[in-house]
């Protein structure tokens, strides 16, 4: 039976009738309308934006359209007191400061609330000292600064260059290198494309241009001041000092002309290999402190932001499901902005927004989804996925039962070269049969399909003539429903070519220069790659909505698990000598994926012969595919992590925009030849070989015949 | 019970080539990665190469010069070596994981 048919609705009414009526032009207005002024988490005019969305939801057509409020933790420059970083000469005279804000674009003069670059959630301070280059701030390059070449970070202030990991992860480790502050840079290496104009002549970063970002380390926590609950009327708060994943240090984001000046004088160690040099004409030495010359002088950080619990408001839309009311599918994305969030996020609110009016269009002329689709327009993302979090944690009793999926919506864009889809495995088969129907928007592909073009410019490194999907990591409002609550969840976008653009996320995010202009102009002047991320998403979202049976495959798991499995092991077996000696068997691991592979084909087998038209039994089934992701969760949760449950998928440790797999496994053997006691280590790795191996058998088990 | 036997090492001169086998029986070898680890005299046990459902991995000592590959119809690992160096002389294992080893064939690279 088709899904029209289930819901008794005219044949018009499908796929074909939404996507039809889907517009470019309304996106471009929607974007235009959403970028006038700053949408900053907290402030009233992203309070406005909440009602005029909530307003123009009712009016598309939805059954009803709430505001969810909270009263979270967030973070803000002090409006007369400036945050800054000086040199300093041996009196202690400031010979140089870094600028207090960006130069504003063209058009944006006059535009009051522009929040100054800041790092959200910093502590105060006026730390000095000498500084130390830590490159990316990742886990190696401490490794490599204080492993091979000996440099103490203790005391002092490092400045590491943003990009390939979240900035929360390069202030956790310098923290736990002894450094008193940290100061982020962007370098042209990573955020100026060769051959492109700076902003407002192209998409490029100028040398002013800073981005901004918050730098907790939450783990999935929500509100730092309530951990597992919501922050609602009657919430009881931590104190500060309990507060969940602060910094501890000073931190604060400058530009590459700042960044110019501090680095320029830079003395001490060489840098160890060429992959420490960015592209300014500076040489990258490591330190610590200055050169002969300027060995006297000393940075100095200026920091003066305050937390403040605030009020929050989340935008949550209802479209009822006319024979499965009770289960959940969800389209959600932020609202809220560092400054104008020309891409992030309001291409993709403006996706959203053109999404709902598709919908409430189909709905007034009497067509409704056969499951409820419900709409989120989220707060404070930008500050630790905040409104995401305490709404589904205010929820969480009826996401568990009713949870079919959800889908992500923030940026549309991050470049315009090709499709960029990050997802749980059981959304594979959606997403390729989905992109088979959707023509290309790509020069070259007239008349092909998206598939076609995706798969192209992205191939998968697996699998012939298929496209690359990833795996979900974080920093995104999936985190939640994924990470937490085991709610299958996907994620789509329009990217760049990363083999030819190795520069980090797109140069100018999180600026003052992230604009409608640098939209309309730069990125999609057509707004053809936004309507094929609508048609994406929203194709997503009908048919996790709409068709009888859920469009998911269990199969896929499986393959993946294997290929998961593979990857451990061999991480593993790295280690022969500890393995033998602590007697490490992955036999348990493999006999699980074995298990779980055979009772995958065995249930498929079922899903194509079952009575379609018996509602009991199709429920069942249903219910044993939307309940396969809910079952990789550990109630328990991760060593130290407790709020990352999955056990086949969590953020990394060491960057947590990156998903890893087999994660309790994988932190286990890290860096397992440095620890003190080997025998403790080799006992943690095979008890999470346990954990995994009992996840991955217990989850297979709940797709077996049910008697 | 589980059972692993390699075979096919021996003497070669350098820049040659030899080709390991390990026959695996007592379990549903398709199912399980494999591993091939060598121990040279007086020295460590060293990971060479590792081998899942259609993936593999290589230690970075014989990268470009290895191949793993196994033949499941026939419950069979194998190494291919080739531009052997003097320094791949060892006794190499094959190995299922911690627990489960062969007891090795020894490659000597010598002129």
């Known amino acids: 039976k088709s899904s029209n048919e289930a819901t008794n609705i005219t044949p018009k009414h499908n796929m074909k009738a939404f996507l039809d009526e889907l517009k470019a032009e309304n996106i471009k207005k929607f974007l235009y309308n959403f970028t006038q002024i700053p949408h900053l988490a907290g402030t009233e005019q992203n309070f406005q934006l909440a009602k005029q969305i909530q307003s123009q939801w009712k009016e598309f057509g939805l059954d009803s359209v709430e505001l969810a409020h909270y009263d979270v933790l967030l973070s803000y420059p002090n409006k007369t007191h400036p945050n800054y970083i000086s040199i300093i000469n041996e009196d202690g005279n400031e010979i140089f400061n870094t600028s207090l804000f960006e130069p504003p674009p063209p058009g944006y003069e006059n535009v009051s609330d522009i929040v100054p670059p800041f790092s959200a959630f910093s502590p105060q301070g006026m730390p000095e000292g000498d500084l130390v280059y830590v490159n990316y701030a990742r886990t190696e390059d401490f490794f490599k600064l204080e492993r091979d070449m000996k440099i103490n970070c203790s005391g002092k202030i490092v400045i590491a260059r943003y990009g390939k990991v979240f900035r929360g992860n390069k202030v956790k480790n310098a923290q736990l290198a002894g450094a008193k502050g940290v100061i982020l840079y962007s370098d042209p290496a990573d955020y100026f494309a060769p051959g492109v104009k700076s902003y407002p002549d192209g998409w490029n970063l100028p040398g002013g241009g800073v981005q901004r970002g918050n730098i907790l380390n939450l783990n999935g926590a929500g509100d730092p001041l309530t951990p597992g609950y919501p922050a609602n009327e009657y919430a009881y708060r931590r104190g500060i000092a309990e507060a969940v994943g602060l910094p501890s240090i000073p931190v604060h984001p400058i530009g590459y002309y700042d960044a110019q000046k501090l680095l320029e004088k830079m003395g001490g160690s060489a840098p160890p290999d060429s992959s420490w040099r960015g592209s300014l004409k500076v040489p990258y030495n490591v330190g610590p402190g200055f050169t002969g010359n300027f060995s006297t002088q000393k940075v100095k950080m200026h920091i003066h932001s305050t937390n403040e619990v605030t009020r929050i408001y989340n935008v949550i839309g209802t479209l009822r499901g006319a024979v499965e009311p009770d289960r959940y599918v969800i389209l959600g994305g932020h609202r809220d902005s560092w400054v104008f969030g020309g891409i992030d996020p309001q291409s993709g609110a403006a996706v959203v927004h053109e999404i709902v009016r598709s919908f409430g269009t189909l709905k007034k002329e009497g067509w409704r989804p056969r499951r409820t689709i419900l709409f989120a327009s989220w707060d404070a993302e930008e500050f630790g996925l905040l409104g995401s979090t305490e709404w589904a944690e205010e929820n969480s009793r009826l996401l568990q039962e009713r949870g079919v999926a959800y889908i992500n919506a923030d940026s549309s864009i991050e470049g315009n070269y090709t499709l960029r889809v990050d997802c749980t495995p059981l959304m594979y088969s959606l997403v390729h049969n989905l992109t088979k129907e959707l023509k290309s928007p790509d020069e070259g592909f007239e008349g092909k399909s998206l598939y076609e073009s995706w798969t192209k410019k992205s191939p998968s490194p697996e699998f012939s003539g298929m496209p690359r999907i990833s795996k979900l990591g974080s920093g995104n409002d999936f985190e939640v429903f994924f990470q937490r609550l085991g709610i299958a969840s996907g994620r789509a976008r329009y990217t760049k070519n990363w083999e030819t653009n190795k520069f980090s996320g797109y140069p100018l995010y999180h600026s003052v220069y992230e604009t409608y202009e640098l939209v309309e102009k730069f990125y999609d002047p057509m707004f053809k790659y936004h309507l094929t991320v609508a048609q994406v998403r929203g194709g997503m979202v009908f048919e996790l909505a709409n068709s009888i049976v859920l469009p998911f495959d269990c199969r896929d798991y499986a393959v993946v698990l294997r290929k998961y499995a593979d990857k451990i092991y061999s991480i593993s077996m790295k280690h022969p000598q500890e393995m033998k000696t602590y007697s490490v068997s992955f036999d348990s691991l493999f006999s699980a994926v074995k298990n779980f592979t055979e009772i995958a084909s065995k249930f498929s087998e079922r899903l194509q012969d079952f009575d379609k038209s018996n509602p009991i039994v199709l429920r069942m089934m249903n219910d044993q595919l939307m309940f396969l992701e809910r079952a990789f969760i550990d109630p328990l949760g991760l060593p130290d992590r407790p709020f990352y449950r999955h056990v086949i998928y969590a953020p990394s440790s060491h960057n947590k925009y990156a998903g890893e797999s087999f994660p309790g496994i994988y932190d286990a053997l890290f860096d397992i030849e440095s620890k003190v006691d080997p025998s403790k280590a080799w006992g943690e790795v095979k008890r999470q070989i346990y954990v995994a191996a009992f996840t991955v058998q217990a989850a297979a088990e709940t797709l077996s015949e049910v008697a | 019970e589980v059972q692993l036997v390699e075979s096919g090492g021996g003497l070669v001169q350098p820049g040659g080539s030899l080709r390991l086998s390990c026959a695996a029986s007592?379990?549903?070898?398709?199912?399980?990665?494999m591993s091939w680890v060598r121990q040279a005299p007086g020295k460590g046990l060293e990971w060479v190469s590792s081998?899942?459902?259609?993936?593999?991995y290589y230690a970075d000592s014989v990268k470009g010069r290895f191949t793993i590959s196994r033949d499941n119809s026939k419950s069979t690992l194998y190494l291919q070596m080739n531009s052997l160096r003097a320094e791949d002389t060892a006794v190499y294992y094959c190995?299922?994981?911690?627990?489960?080893w062969g007891q090795g064939t020894l490659v000597t690279v010598s002129s």
């Open positions: 190995a299922k994981d911690g627990v489960h």
């Open positions: 007592g379990f549903t070898f398709s199912s399980y990665a």
């Open positions: 081998i899942g459902d259609g993936t593999t």
